[in-house]
């Protein structure tokens, strides 16, 4: 219980100003904690680098859609 209460929160304070090719992206996670100053997305690249991005930007939304589709149940 104490460990969960004191678990560190990852926040993004700055966003990348470069669009990242979806071919370089492996996964993402959303930062939704109210303890963080900004709503953010953290992309993990295929070389395991983590990059903060702005979820309001269309390329970020499109990249999340692309990664989501890779997890989807095959259509019959």
């Amino acid at each position: 219980q104490p460990d969960a209460i004191n678990a560190p929160v990852t926040c993004c304070y700055n966003f990348t100003n470069r669009k990242i090719s979806v071919q370089r992206l492996a996964s993402y996670r959303r930062i939704t904690s109210s303890k963080c100053p900004k709503e953010a997305v953290i992309f993990k690249t295929i070389v395991a680098k983590e990059i903060c991005a702005d979820p309001k930007q269309k390329w970020v939304q499109d990249s999340m859609d692309h990664l989501d589709k890779q997890t989807q149940t095959p259509k019959t």
Partner: nanobody, 123 residues
Amino acid sequence: EVQLVESGGGLVQAGGSLRLPCAASGRTFSSYRMGWFRQAPEKEREFVAVISRSGGDTFYSSSVKGRFTISRDNAKNTVYLQMNSLKPEDTAVYYCAAGAQMGWAEASTYDYWGQGTQVTVSS
């Protein structure tokens, strides 16, 4: 936080139609994958439909495919579930959810949930 409010539920005869809107407020609506789930009495919550952020991709459970249509209007911060050819087995509480984490139809990848709207289909 994202707040989700479903409406449009009610009592309908088998073969009828309903449209369920879900209005979102709080954070950037267009940055969330949106889904509909349902829970019938004494049953587990089940996935119904999902739509991508752009609205360009959708996916349906086999039990509703061809009868239900999910759509979204990012300008109005609203997602819709159009339900046609309703059957008594569609009776359930319908929940709208916003998907923040990577995934597609898995309930665990949806961070925000509405309170639900009751749909009852009589025979």
